[in-house]
């Protein structure tokens, strides 16, 4: 049994890091393998992650971590029984994929303005809380070409757009994702999408 593709890990910089790897053949990850991880710190304890299958030869493990900070570094040991298959390390702050924003809501009752709001996925005491920027994707269910991205580079989790910038009388969907420049993160997954019917009063022609 050999590792074909070494584990690569990403952290949500809060409580979970996800590691994925590939074996050289079909593997029952949860019964045959264990991923041991330990913070390089005074008094830290070793933890064991039981991997799940991710395709025939692929495995994925969700590592639970407390109080993730930029100074943290973890040792990783992948075991098959008594055999050490791979040894490595992982610094969560250097491989961050933020959590997806939540509670995306479209407020249509503001005069001819659409107000989109969502929730920051981090608590205020997490460093990323004040460092997320967002991308909002709005698209028409009727017209695949009517697809737009709005970059929200300020901290407030909201976006205002004129309803007239979208077509009236048709349904739209929106979703939002986040990233943080400070840790050069990847983009988060998209939030679940929300749907609304766009209607506004056309101005009278003179």
């Amino acid at each position: 049994m050999k590792v074909l593709q070494e584990p690569t890990c990403v952290s949500d910089y809060m409580s979970i890091s996800t590691c994925e790897w590939k074996m050289n053949g079909p593997t029952n990850c949860s019964t045959e393998l264990r991923l041991l991880y330990q913070l390089v710190f005074l008094l830290s304890e070793a933890h064991t992650c039981i991997p799940e299958n991710n395709g025939g030869a692929g495995c994925v493990c969700h590592l639970l971590m407390d109080d993730v900070v930029s100074a943290d570094n973890y040792t990783l040991d992948l075991w098959a029984g008594q055999q050490l298959l791979w040894k490595g390390s992982f610094k969560p702050s250097e491989h961050v994929k933020p959590r997806a924003p939540g509670n995306l809501t479209v407020h249509t009752n503001v005069s001819d303005t659409l107000l989109l709001t969502w929730s920051n996925p981090y608590p205020p005491d997490n460093y990323l809380y004040n460092h997320l920027t967002y991308a909002v994707n709005i698209w028409s269910e009727n017209d695949p070409a009517d697809f737009r991205i709005y970059n929200v580079t300020y901290l407030e989790p909201s976006l205002r757009i004129a309803a007239s910038t979208l077509k009236s009388g048709i349904s739209y969907r929106a979703r939002v994702r986040a990233w943080a420049q400070c840790y050069n993160t990847t983009w988060s997954e998209w939030s679940p999408s929300t749907k609304w019917h766009n209607s506004y009063r056309e101005p009278f022609e003179q």
């Epitope: 005074l42 008094l43 304890e45 407390d66 109080d67 900070v69 930029s70 005491d125």
Partner: antibody
Framework: QVQLVQSGAEVKKPGASVKVSCKAS????????MHWARQAPGQGLEWMGI????????SYAQKFQGRVTMTRDTSTSTVYMELSSLRSEDTAVYYC?????????WGKGTLVTVSS | QSVLTQPPSVSAAPGQKVTISCSGG????????VSWYQQLPGTAPKLLIY???KRPSGIPDRFSGSKSGTSATLAITGLQTGDEADYYC????????????FGTGTKLTVL
């Protein structure tokens, strides 16, 4: 919000022991290390040791080895610091502080006076 | 005796800028992360800067930290009378046995 509430001031005689408590609230108690530091009157901060509330393991500064004991009670989210064989130089304010590489939150401190 | 050396005192007028240095060595500041703590008179220390240059939420951007080699600096701009306090740097001694270290402390007086 995070709170670290320490026990009240103590006056002890040389040779005696003192046990200071620090009750934590507002966060997951076992997820964060707890440090103890002290500050003698008019002096700077001095690190004493650290406890991992999850398993109860400890590490102490060499200066206090053999005299200090740190424990925790997960049922009450409280950590304790006991210092024995007290001498006058141990007169200080004793602080518990939550954190790992740096100390996010500090208790208000407990003044321990050692005097005959 | 702390191996992190700070000036015993610094002073400046309100509105001015002041810097406080923290000098260490390759086995501590040079190989670890620096934090800064503010201790107002009669109170417990409070985290001001961590990870060399990051501010916890609620700390104004008048406070900034930097690190270069084996020394670190805390800068305070737009000094206010409420900034009058003792300031301590902190880091880790990475040579066994690893342990946290505090600087000698600096008394800031706002004139």
């Amino acid at each position: 919000q995070v709170q670290l509430v320490q026990s009240g001031a103590e006056v002890k005689k040389p040779g005696a022991s003192v046990k200071v408590s620090c009750k934590a609230s507002g966060y997951a108690f076992t997820s964060y290390y707890m440090h103890w530091a002290r500050q003698a009157p008019g002096q700077g901060l001095e690190w004493m040791g650290i406890i991992n509330p999850s398993g109860g393991s400890t590490s102490y500064a060499q200066k206090f080895q053999g005299r200090v004991t740190m424990t925790r009670d997960t049922s009450t989210s409280t950590v304790y610091m006991e210092l024995s064989s007290l001498r006058s130089e141990d007169t200080a304010v004793y602080y518990c502080a939550r954190g790992k590489w740096w100390l996010y939150n500090w208790g208000k401190g407990t003044l321990v006076t050692v005097s005959s | 005796q702390s191996v992190l050396t700070q000036p015993p005192s610094v002073s400046a007028a309100p509105g001015q800028k002041v810097t406080i240095s923290c000098s260490g060595g390759s086995s501590n500041i040079g190989n670890s992360y620096v934090s800064w703590y503010q201790q107002l008179p009669g109170t417990a220390p409070k985290l001001l800067i961590y990870d060399n240059n990051k501010r916890p939420s609620g700390i104004p951007d008048r406070f900034s930290g930097s690190k270069s080699g084996t020394s670190a600096t805390l800068a305070i701009t737009g000094l206010q009378t409420g900034d009058e306090a003792d300031y301590y740097c902190g880091t880790w001694d990475t040579s066994p046995p690893t342990k946290p270290l505090f600087g000698t402390g600096t008394k800031l007086t706002v004139l």
